[in-house]
């Protein structure tokens, strides 16, 4: 409904695989087990940020 999700910064065990809910500009980093600043995908051949919408899976770039 467009409501901004609350950032949860509770400590989680190393074995926890349940992602923390993060705000719109962040994503869950399983390495540090917390929300971190997250960038939009950068297209390698142009160097420009793609128009990837939140919730859209990234697709690998094809090598020649």
């Amino acid at each position: 409904m467009g409501a901004r999700r609350l950032r949860v910064r509770s400590q989680r065990s190393r074995d926890s695989s349940v992602p923390t809910q993060c705000n719109q500009t962040e994503c869950f980093d399983p390495l540090v087990r917390n929300c971190v600043s997250c960038e939009l995908f950068h297209t390698p051949d142009t160097g420009h940020t793609s128009s990837l919408e939140p919730g859209t899976a990234l697709q690998p770039q094809e090598g020649s």
């Epitope: 910064r9 400590q11 190393r14 992602p19 993060c22 994503c27 869950f28 980093d29 399983p30 390495l31 540090v32 087990r33 917390n34 971190v36 600043s37 997250c38 960038e39 939009l40 995908f41 950068h42 990837l52 939140p54 919730g55 859209t56 899976a57 990234l58 690998p60 770039q61």
Partner: antibody, heavy 125, light 107 residues
């Protein structure tokens, strides 16, 4: 332009201490996790520690746990590695690196995209 | 801790060759693998992240694939500037561990 500059390396005797600094520019360290990675002469890369400066969470390699402390000063946009009880096997070039995250369904798809030039730590009597 | 085993540890190749380096994780790391290139006296450079995503500015002759435990870095046509040491790294769980490295030398 994103840049990381390490300093503080040098020659120290076994059992001694050093504090390494990693000064960041072009981004705010509180937005990312900052990592220290080392490389002994002629050897491969070994991760040492990370910190998320926004909340101070840290983790360490078993080989340095209890001896090294990673910290960050967000006002100075700088991360630190305090190294105590140094051993000969800690001799290495120490790099700091930024972990970047790209959003993949709300989960980080990331890696260490920017690295400093490295600072040499030599532990010898 | 998750172990990352790279093979081969070194290889000799010629300019224009297709080169493949493999990395095996001791447990499932999904696609949380990065590949780096390092030249003597220099810091590592990121090539591939999340197993198959080419990092910005990296030539398209580099590609990565794999998921789970088996991963591959391929250089489709080796160039003179590609002679270096390559490392894989898993970032699925802490500690983030590196492979032992693969040195690509001139034949």
């Amino acid at each position: 332009e994103v840049q990381l500059v390490e300093s503080g390396g040098g020659l120290v005797q076994p059992g001694g201490s050093l504090r390494l600094s990693c000064a960041a520019s072009g981004f705010t360290i509180s937005s990312n996790s900052i990592h220290w990675v080392r490389q002994a002469p002629g050897k491969g890369l070994e991760w040492v520690a990370w910190i998320t400066p926004s909340d101070g969470n840290t983790d360490y390699a078993d080989s340095v746990k209890g001896r090294f402390t990673i910290s960050a000063d967000t006002s100075k946009n700088t991360a630190y590695l305090q190294m105590n009880s140094l051993r000969a096997e800690d001799t290495a070039v120490y790099y700091c690196a930024r972990r970047v995250c790209y959003n993949n369904l709300g989960v980080c798809a990331g890696a260490m995209d920017y690295w400093g030039q490295g600072t040499l730590v030599t532990v010898s009597s | 801790d998750i172990q990352m085993t790279q093979s081969p540890s070194s290889l000799s190749a010629s300019v224009g060759d297709r080169v493949t380096i493999t990395c095996r994780a001791s447990q499932d790391v999904s696609t949380a693998v990065a590949w780096y290139q390092q030249k003597p006296g220099k810091a590592p450079k990121l090539l591939i992240y999340s197993a198959s995503f080419l990092y910005s500015g990296v030539p398209s002759r580099f590609s990565g694939s794999g998921s789970g435990t088996d991963f591959t870095l391929t250089i489709s046509s080796l160039q003179p500037e590609d002679f270096a040491t390559y490392y894989c790294q898993q970032t699925s769980t802490s500690p983030p561990t590196f492979g032992q490295g693969t040195k690509v030398e001139i034949k």
